[in-house]
């Protein structure tokens, strides 16, 4: 057979589906690899072929589309399972071809078991809600295309193992779950179970996501440098170790990059000849505010080093700040004999 453009195994699209539930999987070729869609390909005379490799096997085999009740079927560029079974786990390949053209991609499909509280090895999407920010909603994800708009499914929402009813600030509204005012206690896993009929059968779709309550933009402030500050003076003798912490508090900001850095005499530590080490530690609050500490360390400080300017800088999407550390050379205590001699006017 002629050469086929093989995009390999697309591990970026590790698809996980629950056992005994419907699953519709679009061929990734049209979504991520080719510049045309299925309709264009179909009208150009290209055919989409599906096959798979079972888990722990090397042999590629065609997918059996003649199972009872059409358990596995193909519709346009979608592979359907009604429903999945545990042993459907494997690598699936979709190939688009005619006599002159061929392109294919494989992707892993994992059929996952869940317990009665919806716990499973499924990787969960995270939805961030702002704390105390007014009404915010989450929507039951990835249910489009499973049933026509004429079908009215029933949707039940759960938090963890518990059905959401009479919760203090969480209200189920069909496909949406409304948080009247999000609080830390709203952190957790939320599951929607969508139940719909099809050809005399009842199917369930289970979708779980993690809600993380984060700092509100109304509370967000520019970075705050807690150290160095005006109250602490780093007074050292030559030969001692100089340790200056730069501690910065960053409000949570969606998609903001938080940066902390030191300059010594206006230059980055990498650009100067002093033997400086910088160690960083990061801690997060319950609402994902961040405290970064960068400790500047000079093992054996010289009198020249003690004359330099040490400035801590911080930047986030809210702004940039800087603070200089107060560094000075410790004045040695006067030696008694010298002081006495001076007192008597000796030269």
């Amino acid at each position: 057979s002629e050469r086929c453009d093989d995009w390999g195994l697309d591990t970026m699209r590790q698809i996980q589906v629950f056992e005994d539930e419907p699953a519709r999987i679009k061929c990734p070729l049209f979504e991520h690899f080719l510049k045309f869609n299925y309709s264009t390909a179909h009208s150009a005379g290209l055919t989409l072929i599906w096959y798979w490799t079972r888990q722990d096997r090397d042999l590629e085999e065609p997918i059996n589309f003649r199972l009872p009740e059409n358990r596995i079927s193909k519709e346009k560029d979608v592979l359907w399972f009604r429903p999945t079974l545990l042993n459907d786990t494997g690598n699936y390949t979709c190939m688009l071809r005619n006599t002159t053209y061929c392109s294919k991609v494989a992707f892993p499909l994992e059929v996952v078991q869940k317990d009665s509280c919806f716990n499973s090895p499924m990787k969960l999407p995270v939805h961030k809600l702002y704390i105390e920010y007014g009404i915010q909603r989450i929507t039951c994800p990835n249910v489009d295309g499973y049933f026509p708009s004429s079908v009215k499914p029933t949707i039940t929402w759960y938090m963890g193992c518990y059905k959401i009813q009479n919760f203090n600030n969480v209200i189920p509204e069909g496909m949406n779950l409304s948080f009247l005012i999000a609080l830390i206690s709203n952190n957790g896993n939320y599951t929607c179970v969508v139940t719909y009929p099809e050809n005399g059968r009842t199917f369930h779709l289970t979708r779980t996501l993690t809600v993380k309550v984060v700092g509100s933009p109304k509370n967000a402030v520019p970075p705050v440098i807690h150290s160095p500050n005006d109250h602490v003076v780093y007074e050292k003798e030559p030969g001692e170790e100089l340790l200056i912490p730069c501690t910065v508090y960053f409000s949570f900001l969606m998609d903001s990059r938080n940066e902390v850095w030191w300059t010594i005499d206006g230059k980055k530590p990498d650009d100067i000849t002093i033997d400086v080490t910088i160690n960083e530690s990061i801690s997060h609050s319950r609402t994902e505010d961040e405290t970064r500490t960068q400790i500047l360390s000079i093992k054996k400080v010289t009198s020249e080093d003690l004359k330099r300017s040490y400035v801590c800088h911080a930047r986030s999407a809210k702004g940039e700040v800087a603070k200089a550390a107060k560094v000075k050379q410790k004045v040695p205590a006067p030696r008694y004999t010298v002081e006495l001699a001076c007192g008597f006017g000796a030269t």
Partner: antibody
Framework: EVQLVESGGGLVQPGGSLRLSCAAS?????????MCWVRQAPGKGLELVSC????????WSASWAKGRFTISRDNSKNTLYLQMNSLRAEDTAVYFC????????????WGQGTLVTVSS | DIQMTQSPSSLSASVGDRVTITCQAS??????LAWYQQKPGQAPKLLIY???TLASGVPSRFSGSGSGTDFTLTISSLQPEDFATYYC??????????FGQGTKVVIK
């Protein structure tokens, strides 16, 4: 009315055990709250003992409480518990049950406390 | 573990006085600090959260300030019902949940 009522305190001998209860009313444990036990020895300050998220059951305990004190909850009874084993004289205190100490705001709530006396 | 140090441990003041209590955290806790008032035989009552936000129903003579490691509770004009013990509480994350040792405000 939203309230917390502790019970189960009393006199116990050193080495003995006791189980404290905190009955919650006016709100539903399954809705997920951060419930804690806080103690206060006579004439002393507040000390955090142990906390639990009522929905998931995830817990946190002070390092000194691990191994001797166990927090739990029964969501069907809307009740928080503290099982205290191998009790010592220094565990003598009023034990308070409190809600939402992880982000105290307008939802913060405390019970009136129950006295535990460990003495022979 | 984090240490929360309050000062003074006790203070005597008169009605109408301006009273200031400080709380120092052994590590930076951002704005995640609450203040409570406790009267003998009663449960603590929340006064201030997020370092400076007044809890509902708390008189405006109470105010809080600070961030990072240094925090202050101020009572602008002490009233007879304010004689009590005051506690700070850090709640930055589960590794920093702790109360200060308390400050007792007594009548001079």
């Amino acid at each position: 009315e939203v309230q917390l009522v502790e019970s189960g305190g009393g006199l116990v001998q050193p080495g003995g055990s006791l189980r404290l209860s905190c009955a919650a009313s006016g709100f539903d444990f399954s809705s997920n709250y951060y419930m804690c036990w806080v103690r206060q020895a006579p004439g002393k300050g507040l000390e955090l003992v142990s906390c639990i998220y009522t929905n998931s059951g995830n817990t946190w305990s002070a390092s000194w409480a691990k191994g001797r004190f166990t927090i739990s909850r029964d969501n069907s009874k809307n009740t928080l518990y503290l099982q205290m084993n191998s009790l010592r004289a220094e565990d003598t205190a009023v034990y308070f049950c409190a809600r939402d100490l992880n982000y105290p705001d307008t939802s913060n709530l405390w019970g009136q406390g129950t006295l535990v006396t460990v003495s022979s | 573990d984090i240490q929360m140090t309050q000062s003074p441990s006790s203070l005597s003041a008169s009605v109408g006085d301006r009273v200031t209590i400080t709380c120092q955290a052994s590590q930076s806790i951002g704005y995640y600090l609450a203040w409570y008032q406790q009267k003998p035989g009663q449960a603590p009552k929340l006064l201030i959260y997020r370092a400076s936000t007044l809890a509902s129903g708390v008189p405006s003579r109470f105010s809080g300030s600070g961030s990072g490691t240094d925090f202050t509770l101020t009572i602008s004009s002490l009233q007879p019902e304010d004689f009590a013990t005051y506690y700070c509480q850090s709640y930055y994350n589960s590794d920093s949940d702790a109360f200060g040792q308390g400050t007792k405000v007594v009548i001079k």
